[in-house]
Interface confidence: low
Amino acid sequence: GSERTCCPVNWVEHERSCYWFSRSGKAWADADNYCRLEDAHLVVVTSWEEQKFVQHHIGPVNTWMGLHDQNGPWKWVDGTDYETGFKNWRPEQPDDWYGHGLGGGEDCAHFTDDGRWNDDVCQRPYRWVCETELDKASQEPPLL
């Protein structure tokens, strides 16, 4: 594939990455799939500076990010090391709360209204943010 050197239309460039901010809501898995079909991934927050950038664009709205623990340990969708990386959880979060009555715990992370993170039921229809890195070799989508 060819190298991507500028962001697609309607995407926002910041620090050699491109970001797309949804204005509708989807379950986490559907949001994840949407980003993948765009040759991108749900946003992976690696610094306080990136956190502030995303927070500025999403405003005080629950928004999915590319962080989940559906297989056990918390993992970023692009393989970034969770344990040693940037975190911005709300106090007492993540708590894997079962009291919501929807079955199971809370396995997907989202930005809350103040930007700090919470774990929630992955089926909730929140907005989402896709991210893709500039200068990475863009891959042709598979023929279905």
Epitope: D69, N71, G72, P73, K75, G79, D81, Y82, E83, T84, K87, E92, P94, D95, D96
Partner: antibody, heavy 115, light 107 residues
Framework: EVQLVESGGGLVKPGGSLRLSCAAS????????MNWVRQAPGKGLEWVSS????????YYADSVKGRFTISRDNAKNSLYLQMNSLRAEDTAVYYC????????WGQGTLVTVSS | DIQMTQSPSSLSASVGDRVTIICRAS??????LAWFQEKPGKAHKSLIY???SLRSGVPSKFSGSGSGTDFNLTISSLQPEDLATYYC?????????FGPGTKVDFK
């Protein structure tokens, strides 16, 4: 420098109990998940249990579920493994290790279960 | 549970040789794979995480590659201090599992 020091191992009879401790230093203990891993004499490595930084999440290998309990005291920078109903097959060196990818390990403490 | 296999189980090589150890997972684990070095009387040493990321302080002669189910650990130029047993570990999902190990010694 990250340091992990295990203690509490020893000889115990089958059916007995032991409590292992791991003293951590050199990092912000409460920010990291922790694990117990064991190695039976002459054998390979076996993951035993994990606990998240806030203690919200705990996980166990099937071989120890219901018998072992992992816990931590972030104020004391300490990790624990309470081992009950011990069996001969639990004989091993027990290591504490940091994070899912086990980036730092202690030297281990030997647990021998024998009558 | 995810099963991890390693090959070979042991190998003998000469100083300066390029050595590759193979690790396979029974299902896709993306890049959630780590490699460790075990030496008698020493704490286990983490070499690689994320399949290919070198831990700080680990010599660059060690490298990791692979994704999905097939992974490699390569020592570009074997030295006497590399005599050890090497293990791979998946941390994609619980229970975490290890390969059976590869013992490296000298001819």
């Amino acid at each position: 420098e990250v340091q992990l020091v295990e203690s509490g191992g020893g000889l115990v009879k089958p059916g007995g109990s032991l409590r292992l401790s791991c003293a951590a230093s050199g990092f912000t203990f409460s920010s990291y998940s922790m694990n117990w891993v064991r190695q039976a004499p002459g054998k390979g490595l076996e993951w035993v249990s994990s606990i998240s930084g806030s203690s919200s999440y705990t996980y166990y290998a099937d071989s120890v579920k219901g018998r072992f309990t992992i816990s931590r005291d972030n104020a004391k920078n300490s990790l624990y493994l309470q081992m009950n109903s011990l069996r001969a097959e639990d004989t091993a060196v027990y290591y504490c290790a940091r994070v899912a990818a086990l980036d730092s390990w202690g030297q281990g403490t030997l647990v021998t279960v024998s009558s | 549970d995810i099963q991890m296999t390693q090959s070979p189980s042991s190998l003998s090589a000469s100083v300066g040789d390029r050595v590759t150890i193979i690790c396979r997972a029974s299902q896709d684990i993306s890049n959630y794979l780590a490699w460790f070095q075990e030496k008698p009387g020493k704490a286990h040493k983490s070499l690689i995480y994320g399949a290919s990321s070198l831990r700080s302080g680990v010599p660059s002669k060690f490298s990791g590659s692979g994704s999905g189910t097939d992974f490699n650990l390569t020592i570009s130029s074997l030295q006497p201090e590399d005599l050890a047993t090497y293990y791979c570990q998946q941390y994609h999902s619980y229970p975490f599992t290890f390969g059976p190990g590869t013992k490296v010694d000298f001819k």
